[in-house]
């Protein structure tokens, strides 16, 4: 025969659990009903009656199975660095995160405490290793027969063109400058075909960086000469 | 206002080891570059280790590399430099540097007070 | 590595003079040098970055020229706050080399 289907509020067995979706309630000892996503227990259960739910109001809201009896409020909207990625809803919190151009530099359980701009290799350097949403560019200087002449998150330290007949030798920051004929371009970064001085660089390729977590709000502006901006976000 | 403030100096014996920290306040550290240098008494200047914002990226000098380890806790706004086989010629008041933030603006702006490591028996 | 020469290690000047140190590189560090300055005790102090552009707070009497693997600080005119040590410093590759420095004393 099927065992009885117990509804809630019950006793549990001596030593049992309440099942999925229900809680123990102390103050009754009974099982009942836990409220789902987006409500919140307006009225806690008796040894006779159910727990009662009543939807979460504006701007808060439940993500799981409960019985608090208050929903959690949503965090504040996001901030000019910050675009929001999931709206407040009765089920879910506001999450922001950092905008094109920004990684989080300090984050929080959901979303991100301190945005900050990207870092811009200089003319000279370019880009080691791409920032991520959670990590900074990584800059490196550019190798003999490799240039970079822009200030720039993303471009990366490319060869100089080769050239029959070379007007001026390129260098870090510039690219070679031919003669008339047409030139070409040097398919490997490292490959320095030109009559360009080629100095011994003991430890040019920069070690390779491991991954990272950096996460971002902005509430101090840099001081000292430029580096990096940060954007404010509220919590 | 900026502030670097070290700690964990003074004297060990040779091959010893050293657990050096830099406390940073009035700027939003988790988004700066950080480097150690240091100054044997009466002698120059020596840049000693380099840690990028967020941990990923380090460089050393070569006289302290696979001895010394720099690291950071952003949630904490510190620094560290641990040293181990520490040797006579790492006697040295060692700074917490901030900068360079590098390829972007190369240069050191701002320095801690340093601590003193002697390195004796 | 990248040898940094900075000259000279020394020099004798009274208040008023223009001083000129300079820093010469074993190759090309494209600008990325920084001076500093330190007086006996404390810590270095940010001057010049990107070898001609003064950092916060620093008296106009200081300069930075150059570019290449040659570079120079000149104090036009030397204040009794001046005297003190000087390093340059690349930022080139790893490692990053500070020159000897140069002890600026007083006549």
């Known amino acids: 025969l099927p065992a009885q289907v117990a509804f809630t509020p019950y006793a549990p067995e001596p030593g049992g659990t309440c099942r999925l979706r229900e809680y123990y309630d102390q103050t009754a000892q009974m099982c009942c009903s836990k409220c789902p996503p987006g409500q919140h227990a307006k009225v806690f259960c008796t040894k006779t009656s159910d727990t009662v739910c009543d939807s979460c109001e504006d701007s808060t809201y439940t993500q799981l199975w409960n019985w608090v009896p208050e929903c959690l409020s949503c965090g504040s909207r996001c901030s000019s660095d910050q675009v929001e990625t999931q709206a407040c809803t009765r089920e879910q919190n506001r999450i922001c995160t950092c905008r094109p151009g920004w990684y989080c530099a300090l984050s929080k359980q959901e979303g991100c405490r301190l945005c900050a701009q990207l870092r811009k290799c200089r003319p000279g350097f370019g880009v080691a290793r791409p920032g991520t949403e959670t990590s900074d560019v990584v800059c490196k200087p550019c190798a003999p027969g490799t240039f970079s002449n822009t200030t720039s998150s993303t471009d990366i330290c490319r060869p100089h063109q080769i050239c029959h007949v070379v007007a001026i030798p390129g260098n870090a920051s510039m690219d070679a400058v031919c003669t008339s004929t047409s030139p070409t371009r040097s398919m490997a970064p490292g490959a320095v075909h030109l009559p360009q001085p080629v100095s011994t660089r003991s430890q040019h390729t920069q070690p390779t960086p491991a991954p990272s977590t950096a996460p971002g709000t902005s509430f101090l502006l840099p001081v000292g000469p430029s580096p990096p901006a940060e954007g404010s976000t509220g919590d | 206002e900026v502030q670097l403030v070290e700690s964990g100096g003074g004297l060990v014996q040779p091959g010893g080891s050293l657990r050096l920290s830099c406390a940073a306040s009035?700027?939003?550290?988790?988004?700066?570059?950080l480097s150690w240098v240091r100054q044997a008494p009466g002698k120059g200047l020596e840049w000693v280790a380099y840690i990028n914002n967020g941990g990923i990226s380090t460089y050393y000098s070569d006289t302290v590399k696979g001895r010394f380890t720099i690291s950071r806790d952003n949630a904490k706004n510190t620094l560290y430099l641990q040293m181990n086989s520490l040797r006579a010629e790492d006697t040295a008041v060692y700074y917490c540097?901030?900068?360079?933030?590098?390829?972007?603006?190369?240069?050191?702006?701002?320095w801690g007070q340093g601590t003193l490591v002697t390195v004796s028996s | 590595d990248i040898q940094m020469t900075q000259s000279p290690s020394s020099l004798s000047a009274s208040v008023g003079d223009r001083v000129t140190i300079t820093c010469r590189t074993s190759?090309?560090?494209?600008?990325?040098l920084p001076w500093y300055q330190q007086k006996p005790g404390k810590a270095p102090k940010l001057l010049i970055y990107?070898?001609?552009k003064l950092a916060e707070g620093v008296p106009s009497r200081f300069s930075g020229s150059g570019s290449g693997t040659d570079y120079t600080l000149t104090i036009s005119s030397l204040q009794p706050e001046d005297f003190a040590t000087y390093y340059c410093q690349h930022f080139w590759v790893t490692p990053w080399t500070f020159g000897q420095g140069t002890k600026v004393e007083i006549k």
């Open positions: 190759e090309s560090i494209y600008s990325n």
């Open positions: 540097v901030r900068g360079p933030f590098y390829g972007s603006a190369n240069y050191f702006d701002y």
């Open positions: 990107d070898a001609t």
């Open positions: 009035g700027f939003a550290f988790s988004t700066y570059d």
